[in-house]
């Protein structure tokens, strides 16, 4: 990636890291308003299976692993990217390495959910306070989950699907920060590990993933009022280990693995028409990216 200053533009979709033949250090940003990609400062260490989030205008890369010809190292790292300076800086590491992690943000705090360290599949969850640069464990999930999708709705943290080390999961659970407790919610219609999970219009969407046999293109959403999961239009491509984010009322899914190919495809879902469209391609195919959108 280039080391010059990033252009000071509005909301961009950032994609960090990923995997193609080995873990990647790319940081790239897509501008949906003009369809362009920016090549930004590389991660200091390549990683796949990471998660991305934005707090206070800064992009955070959380967990993952560095799978390279030299070896394979799960990551406990938290790194912070400043779009104004186009530079990465390390923050306090998590208590344990977490590959194929999920993250969510509540009240400016980053929650790191599940993930794996070697063959250990975590149910533990920890919270990062950027002002103090500190991590603290909170209540563990009821289920061990890697490849877990995480989303925040109404200041509640949802952990959806994943893999417990034996089975891929359709179960989901919700964390209540005030009570510091997890409760199961209605299970999805479909087993999904490595799905893309996000929130749009008061619903939690789960897109794609892997059911233990095949990659999926199906998409379902959870209505917190009715506590039910309903299918919406499927994506054009089957994909697991995809990136997902929401930008201006639309869902974007980035890359992933379809069982044969590392996808460069980026699809966009319009909830008004219940349709998916191909909007762009990443500069190269990859799975296991961390994705987030900058604030205004």
């Amino acid at each position: 990636g280039s080391m010059g200053h990033a252009p000071k533009v509005g909301r961009l979709i950032y994609t960090a890291g990923g995997y193609f033949r080995q873990s990647l250090s790319y940081l790239e940003a897509y501008n949906p308003s003009d369809g362009t990609w920016l090549d930004l400062a590389d991660l200091q260490v390549p990683r796949s299976g990471l998660a991305g989030c934005v707090v206070g205008g800064l992009l955070y890369a959380v967990g993952g692993r560095n799978n390279s010809p030299d070896g394979n190292t799960d990551s406990s790292a938290l790194d912070c990217y400043n779009p104004m300076t186009n530079q990465w800086s390390p923050c306090a590491p998590m208590s344990v390495p977490r590959n194929r992690i999920g993250v969510g943000v509540i009240d400016g705090h980053i929650y790191a959910v599940g993930g794996s360290h070697g063959c250990i599949h975590h149910n533990s969850v920890e919270r990062y306070e950027p002002e103090r640069d500190e991590w603290h464990l909170v209540a563990p999930m009821l289920t061990r989950r890697i490849g877990v999708g995480v989303a925040v709705l109404n200041r509640l943290l949802y952990a959806v699907g994943g893999f417990d080390g034996t089975n891929r999961l359709n179960s989901a659970e919700c964390y209540y920060p005030e009570r510091n407790e997890w409760r199961m919610i209605t299970a999805m219609n479909t087993i999904r590990s490595g799905a893309g999970v996000c929130v749009l219009h008061n619903c939690i969407y789960a897109a794609g993933g892997y059911d233990g046999q095949d990659q999926l293109n199906s998409v379902e959403r959870y209505d917190v009022e009715t506590e039910t999961w309903t299918f919406v239009a499927p994506m054009k491509h089957r994909r697991s280990a995809l990136g997902i984010t929401v930008h201006q009322g639309r869902i974007y899914v980035l890359g992933g693995y379809d069982g044969h190919t590392f996808l460069d495809s980026v699809e966009c879902y319009d909830p008004d028409t219940d349709t998916w469209s191909e909007v762009t391609r990443m500069t190269s195919g990859r799975s296991g990216v961390g994705v987030a959108v900058t604030m205004e």
Epitope: C119, Y210, A241, G259, F262
Partner: antibody, heavy 118, light 107 residues
Framework: EVQLVESGGGLVQPGGSLRLSCAAS????????IHWVRQAPGKGLEWVAS????????LYAKSVAGRFTISADTSKNTAYLQMNSLRAEDTAVYYC???????????WGQGTLVTVSS | DIQMTQSPSSLSASVGDRVTITCRAS??????VAWYQQKPGKAPKLLIY???SLYSGVPSRFSGSRSGTDFTLTISSLQPEDFATYYC?????????FGQGTKVEIK
């Protein structure tokens, strides 16, 4: 019945290449990790490579990294091990196996012998 | 890399004997240890996974246990078909590694 059948072994000169195949039946290779393990004549077992069906990520032993490539074709239900820049110390019986139970491997093929010699 | 030190490298026993084979991991591998049986010219067969879980179809005379970083395969009453080489394997940490094998021979 679950079966794995390796093929593609043989005699090759140092520096040469071979592509091993592992044809699976009785299960879908998209549903399990696939591993290659080798055994030099009269020696023990050595894990070589694996592929994850969910993420597509591959892992390699340091002794083969950069020279060997594991892949899978789910339409043919077959896994492959492409071996380049072969060395005498790569001489072994190569087994493919199915990862289950935290990557303990529950089914193995019969093995295919690779001999690297001039 | 994690070393799996297997002992003994060989042993002689009689039908009906109780046989114990040990693997010591050079660092913690949790319970991510499997045991395999291999006969000459054949592929290995899974006996035990997750340190102590008996694989489907394996006779109950085989058992596995863990004490810290020490792992044990026990054959409670050796049968003629049990004369073979036995390997332990850890899959806790990359790369997966095997013990060097224990050959069980007829006394």
């Amino acid at each position: 019945e679950v079966q794995l059948v390796e093929s593609g072994g043989g005699l090759v000169q140092p520096g040469g290449s071979l592509r091993l195949s592992c044809a699976a039946s009785g299960f879908a290779i998209s549903a399990s990790s696939i591993h290659w393990v080798r055994q030099a004549p009269g020696k023990g077992l050595e894990w070589v490579a694996s592929i994850d069906p969910e993420t597509g990520e591959t892992l390699y032993a340091k002794s083969v990294a950069g020279r060997f490539t594991i892949s899978a074709d789910t339409s043919k239900n077959t896994a492959y091990l492409q071996m380049n820049s072969l060395r005498a110390e790569d001489t072994a019986v190569y087994y493919c196996s199915r990862g289950q139970y935290g990557d303990a491997t529950d089914y193995w093929g019969q093995g295919t012998l690779v001999t690297v010699s001039s | 890399d994690i070393q799996m030190t297997q002992s003994p490298s060989s042993l002689s026993a009689s039908v009906g004997d109780r046989v114990t084979i040990t693997c010591r991991a050079s660092q913690s591998v949790s319970s991510a240890v499997a045991w395999y049986q291999q006969k000459p010219g054949k592929a290995p067969k899974l006996l035990i996974y997750s340190a102590s879980s008996l694989y489907s179809g394996v006779p109950s005379r085989f058992s596995g246990s863990r004490s810290g970083t020490d792992f044990t395969l026990t054959i409670s009453s050796l049968q003629p078909e049990d004369f073979a080489t036995y390997y332990c394997q850890q899959s806790y940490s990359f790369p997966s590694t095997f013990g060097q094998g224990t050959k069980v021979e007829i006394k």
